[in-house]
């Protein structure tokens, strides 16, 4: 049966026993800045082009052993959530991956900047259709990273990022705090904010909306046909990147402001239990869970 | 041809630039009242001291970015410091990424075209 997260973002009209918008997101290219990925996994084969971009720090620890499946784990799962054949949101979207996170899931602001610059240069050299950039990462507040995101957004690129998994104000993190970026928090099957160990999803005025981010089934790099459940604001951001790809594929001329407005408009309102957030953040945190547009847009979104 | 040469001629190039700016009024030093600022990650364990993103003012051309980077290297070398330019940014933001001692920050902040400098820091998969 349909995974809970795909059911949650699907308008009631489409809730059959399967989720299959036939060509969702086919006009859009989604860039993923993350770990390396297993690009020939059955769930994503042919959908992800691995660019030659790589800018990662050395792994910590003298006894660290690079295990390919672990190195690829985070990125493979997210690529599957965005465009996977069976568990993906935008099954028609094509993706390009840039490696900015090492085998321990760690990167640098500078490496991310160089990655964003690479995307801009690629866009200038070979202009294609709409671009979505997924940044499933977070660091401390960074003026320069936010500035780079602003410039890329002004060049017509849609940037989607994880709010962060620190159970904290997203405005203290980047790129989550960049105003031009669509910042996504994580909710679970009960529409509760996601708890991750002692921490959980970030919140606050820098979050634009929430999306499913707990127990999300997606491609596992353990084997070419494996699936695994992962949780985090990265998974939530991947859902919104997929939804954005479908919206832009249906309406390629949408501006960032219009897309943001549509994402908010079609979200489920006031379903999140705000008691989870600190009292002073409740009024600042948007009570919105991302969803695809309803059946009135059938011809646009499910062509 | 001299403009294209790197480190060895850096001091000479600086001198030429200084003289030229005196002659034709080109303001190569920071304008009065616009002091470049330094930023670093508020979360100490995530800081990566020793690597800095030098962000230049918005309309700075690539050639000026390269020249500013070489100028920093030359001034640092004069003070006995080794520096390494890791990347020159253009396309999104003008600037460069430099590996250097934090002792040189004051010097770098005074370079022409500099808007701000940010110490590199870590980002993490979420």
């Amino acid at each position: 049966s349909i995974p809970w997260n795909l059911e949650r973002i699907t308008p009631p009209r489409y809730r059959a026993d399967e989720y299959q918008p036939p060509d969702g997101g086919s006009l859009v290219e989604v860039y993923l800045l993350d770990t390396s990925i297993q690009s020939d996994h059955r769930e994503i084969e042919g959908r992800v082009m691995v660019t030659d971009f790589e800018n990662v720090p050395e792994e910590d620890g003298t006894r660290f052993h690079r295990q390919a499946s672990k190195c690829d784990s985070h990125g493979t799962h997210l690529a599957g959530v965005v465009s996977g054949r069976d568990a993906g949101v935008a099954k028609g979207a094509s993706m390009r991956s840039l490696r900015v996170l090492n085998c321990q899931g760690k990167g640098t602001v500078s490496g991310t900047l160089i990655g964003l610059e690479f995307i801009r240069k690629s866009q200038l050299v070979q202009p294609v259709g709409p671009l979505v950039v997924l940044l499933p990462l977070a660091g401390g507040y960074s003026r320069v990273l936010n500035a780079a995101c602003q410039r890329l957004a002004r060049a017509g690129v849609v940037l989607v990022t994880a709010a962060g998994n620190f159970r904290d104000d997203a405005c203290l993190y980047s790129p989550a705090s960049a105003p031009e970026v669509i910042t996504v928090g994580a909710t679970n099957a009960q529409d509760q904010p996601v708890t991750l160990g002692t921490l959980g999803t970030n919140f606050g005025r820098c979050v634009d909306l929430f999306a499913p981010g707990e127990d999300i089934i997606g491609a596992s790099s353990d084997c070419s046909t494996c699936f695994v459940s992962q949780s985090g604001t990265s998974q939530a951001a991947a859902h919104v990147a997929g939804i954005a790809a479908m919206m832009l594929s249906a309406e390629p001329e949408l501006t960032l402001a219009e897309l943001r407005q549509r994402l908010i408009h079609f979200s489920a309102k006031d379903v999140i239990n705000e008691a989870w957030f600190p009292e002073d953040q409740r009024v600042l945190t948007p009570n919105l869970v991302a969803a695809l547009p309803p059946s009135t847009h059938e011809n646009l979104y499910f062509q | 041809g001299a403009m294209g040469q790197e480190d060895e001629d850096g001091d000479y190039e600086e001198l030429v630039l200084a003289l030229r700016s005196e002659e034709d009024g080109l303001a190569e030093a920071p304008e009065h009242g616009t002091t470049a600022t330094f930023h670093r990650c508020a979360k100490d364990p995530w800081r990566l001291p020793g690597t800095y993103v030098v962000v230049l003012k918005e309309e700075t051309h690539l050639s000026q970015s390269e020249r500013t980077a070489r100028r920093l290297q030359a001034q640092a070398a004069r003070r006995g410091y080794l520096t390494k330019i890791l990347h020159v940014f253009h396309g999104l933001l003008p600037g460069f990424l430099v590996k250097m001692s934090g002792d040189l920050l004051e010097l770098a902040l005074k370079l022409p075209h500099v808007d701000y400098i940010e110490e590199d820091s870590s980002v993490f998969a979420q």
Epitope: Q38, V50, R85 | -
Partner: antibody, heavy 115, light 109 residues
């Protein structure tokens, strides 16, 4: 254009081994693995397994597990399928195909097992 | 014994429409969006006609269409032409592998 070119026909004795090659071109190799499919005379298609062009990982069908080895040589963009302990019912046309989606096929390699 | 069940043969006259069924279980056809259909002429390798239940690769005529309901997938060929005479195979993902149907011989009368 996207192409898979296979090695020529083979005649083998029972108990022997055969190694069939498949050279890929015209697409980013790491974005797809290679599947191997065989077809006995007058019969249907049988999936034998898959190999990753990205990391060399394999996924073999239970029926041939233990007798088949798939390998890849990234320097020449060539994938190999070796079948050991051949029996007469291994007589078939062996195809390589791109990925699990099998959207592009090689021309086929006839392997005859006969004493 | 093939994992997916197809009729051994179907036939139709030029211009007619025919449908070939492919029945599996919830562990293959019913559980995945990845049902494919292949056309094979004698002595030739199979050619992909439909992928992911209902998508046509570029270059394949729009006379070919695919659908799925529950554990059964279907290939429909409309406006039958002489060159459509061939063997047709369906395939599906399973949890760890791939399975094919036994094949259907299409005769154009």
């Amino acid at each position: 254009q996207v192409q898979l070119v296979q090695s020529g026909a083979e005649v083998k004795k029972p108990g022997a081994s055969v190694k069939v090659s498949c050279k890929a071109s015209g697409y980013p190799l790491t974005s797809y693995g290679i599947s191997w499919v065989r077809q006995a005379p007058g019969q249907g298609l049988e999936w034998m397994g898959w190999i990753s062009a990205y990391n060399g990982n394999t996924n073999y069908a239970q029926k041939v597990q233990g007798r088949v080895t798939m390998t890849t040589d990234t320097s020449t963009s060539t994938v190999y399928m070796e079948l050991r302990s051949l029996r007469s019912d291994d007589t078939a046309v062996y195809y390589c195909a791109r990925g699990y989606g099998m959207d592009v096929w090689g021309q086929g390699t006839t392997v005859t097992v006969s004493s | 014994q093939s994992a997916l069940t197809q009729p051994a043969s179907v036939s139709g006259s030029p211009g007619q429409s025919i449908t070939i069924s492919c029945t599996g279980t919830s562990s293959d056809v019913g559980g995945y969006n990845s049902v494919s259909w292949y056309q094979q002429h004698p002595g030739k390798p199979p050619k992909l006609m439909i992928y992911e239940v209902s998508n046509r690769p570029s270059g394949v005529s729009n006379r070919f269409s695919g659908s799925k309901s529950g554990n059964t997938a279907s290939l429909t060929i409309s406006g039958l032409q002489a060159e459509d005479e061939a063997d047709y195979f369906c395939s599906s993902y399973t949890s760890t592998s791939m399975v094919f149907g036994g094949g259907t011989k299409l005769t154009v009368l």
